[in-house]
């Protein structure tokens, strides 16, 4: 009945509704049907959210912050539904809402606790700072404060730096990890306990590849089954790091099954893509192709990063000419 939020039932006519920032929610309230229905919704027992009586809304004294954001299920009132449809919730809307419902038979009051969460999709970034390599897990906007955990080769790491900036309504969080010289795999998990939402970033360094000029190289990129769900929208990006910055070679969008290729020597195997294998080929290698290649598979729930280091060496032919 109430698809826009989930409720936790607690005693004393009190329910908890969990909403997501900027989304619509429903504050539930029901009553025993009767004639002459009066419905008053209030916030923190002080601010008028919505009033309905004598068959229509009376919003003259509605608090301005709720203007054009509330409505009732008017066709359902006679069936005992006094629920409030609440548009575009913000973190300032968190708190206790009281629904007063009166009929000719009885008066009841229901309390609904609204909690609002934010979880803008996090990202895992791989950065080079001078001679150091860093993995950074970051989330631009999150509320309440999330739980961030790191693992190295599936073993939890206690060291966990968190750079936090708080805005008016949410946190922005960066958690960097120095992985200089490491060949281990790393995993970062960000959990929003309120929204019961978890995001995972996984980073894997593949063995270095040595290739000769003019040869081609195949770089593997296959998602880990634990995270990957082909039914969920995701994006695959291949990029190459040159002098500390990545340039995108190609990307694939699962929603449209579109592949965009920015490098003419890059090729993707369509059949492999259909089997969720995003390995790529780079033809006709030249010396400037040496560097780090990053495959990024990202969805709302995970980011899988795979790093390949490619060394292109001059062919014998080229060396003898020199």
């Amino acid at each position: 009945i109430f698809p826009l939020a989930f409720f936790i039932y607690v005693p004393m006519n009190e329910q908890i509704v969990i909403g997501r920032l900027d989304e619509d929610i429903i504050l539930p309230s029901s009553f025993e049907r009767g004639s002459e229905v009066v419905i008053h919704w209030k916030y923190q027992d002080s601010y008028k959210v919505h009033s309905y009586y004598k068959g229509s809304d009376h919003l003259e004294s509605q608090d301005p912050r709720y203007a054009n954001r509330t409505s009732l299920f008017y066709n359902e009132i006679q069936n005992g539904n006094a629920s409030l449809f609440f548009r575009r919730v913000s973190l300032l809307d968190e708190g206790i809402y009281t629904c007063y419902v009166g009929t000719a038979i009885q008066v009841i009051t229901n309390k609904v606790v609204l909690k609002v969460g934010v979880f803008l999709t996090p990202v895992m970034k791989y950065e080079k700072r001078n001679t150091n390599s860093f993995l950074i897990c970051s989330v631009l906007s999150v509320y309440p404060r999330p739980i961030i955990t790191w693992k190295m080769d599936n073993t939890p790491i206690s060291e966990n730096n968190m750079e936090e900036t708080g805005s008016l309504d949410s946190f922005s969080i960066n958690s960097p990890l120095n992985i200089t010289g490491s060949n281990s795999s790393y995993e970062c998990t960000i959990e929003n306990s309120l929204l019961k939402q978890t995001w995972t970033g996984r980073w894997t360094m593949k063995d270095g590849l040595h290739k000769m000029q003019s040869e081609h190289v195949s770089l593997s990129c296959q998602p880990v089954n634990d995270y990957f769900s082909p039914n969920q929208d995701f994006k695959v990006t291949w990029s190459r790091m040159k002098s500390g910055t990545f340039s995108v070679l190609a990307y694939y969008l699962s929603s449209s099954q579109n592949t965009i290729i920015n490098e003419s020597r890059f090729s993707w195997n369509k059949e492999l893509i259909n089997q969720s294998d995003f390995s790529m080929n780079l033809m006709d290698l030249n010396l400037s192709d040496s560097g780090e290649y990053l495959c990024n598979i990202s969805s709302d729930e995970y980011t899988l990063l795979t790093i390949h280091t490619v060394h292109v060496e001059p062919s014998q032919e080229t060396a003898s000419h020199n």
Epitope: H40, K42, K48, Y53, K54, H58, G102, T103, V107
Partner: antibody, heavy 120, light 107 residues
């Protein structure tokens, strides 16, 4: 059962003030709107004022607007009517009455009334 | 403000008679009308609300009808205990005015 007991009536000179109280019991006072209605003995009913269950809305008859103030203390289950600048024509029995539902404005229970006489 | 009038101002009828009292609003008030009965020396009692809904515990010989500006209270078979003054009240918007009353007694 619902009980409403008015007090504070008496004889007062024109221009003076009086405060009526109404002690409520037998129902959840904080859930209901409350009214004051008056009646000159032997005459008809005149609605005076109403206050919502939470005190957030009040309305008055034109004849008392600006002179009378309705209020309530839900923690004490008590309704009040502060009457200032009393006039001879305010002489009446003042009934405290309970709304059937807050926001509908008709009355399902009445107190026994308290007599206010304004006379010089 | 909306004015309420009642007619007749008084009436006498025999036990068992059908009695009709009318209430008129100077402007439309939908069905936001209540009827009260006040017996001599007693406080008023709610009989009908929403123009036609009988308050619980009120005998079924009382009925109400009407909408807009014209309303009727009917006692289908007058009983001795119905001797009283009957008031209509509009509750569509403030002020929640009462009609002047109709006094009913037994011939």
């Amino acid at each position: 059962q619902v009980q409403l007991v008015e007090s504070g009536g008496g004889v007062v000179q024109p221009g003076r003030s009086l405060r009526l109280s109404c002690a409520a019991s037998g129902f959840t006072f904080s859930n209901y709107g409350m009214h004051w209605v008056r009646q000159v003995p032997g005459k008809g009913l005149e609605w005076v004022a109403v206050i919502w269950y939470d005190g957030s809305e009040k309305d008055y008859a034109d004849s008392v607007k600006g002179r009378f103030t309705i209020s309530r203390d839900n923690s004490k289950n008590t309704l009040y009517l502060q009457m200032n600048s009393l006039r001879v024509e305010d002489t009446a029995v003042y009934y405290c009455a309970k709304d059937l539902i807050s926001g509908i404005y008709y009355v399902d229970h009445w107190g026994q009334g308290t007599l206010v006489t304004v006379s010089s | 403000d909306i004015q309420m009038t009642q007619s007749p101002s008084s009436l006498s009828a025999s036990v068992g008679d059908r009695v009709t009292i009318t209430c008129r609003a100077s402007q439309g008030i939908s069905n936001y009308l209540a009827w009260y009965q006040q017996k001599p020396g007693k406080v008023p009692k709610l009989l009908i609300y929403a123009a036609s809904t009988l308050q619980s515990g009120v005998p079924s010989r009382f009925s109400g009808s009407g909408s807009g500006t014209d309303f009727t209270l009917t006692i289908s078979s007058l009983q001795p205990e119905d001797v009283a003054t009957y008031y209509c009240q509009k509750y569509q918007s403030a002020p929640f005015t009462f009609g002047p009353g109709t006094k009913v007694d037994i011939k």
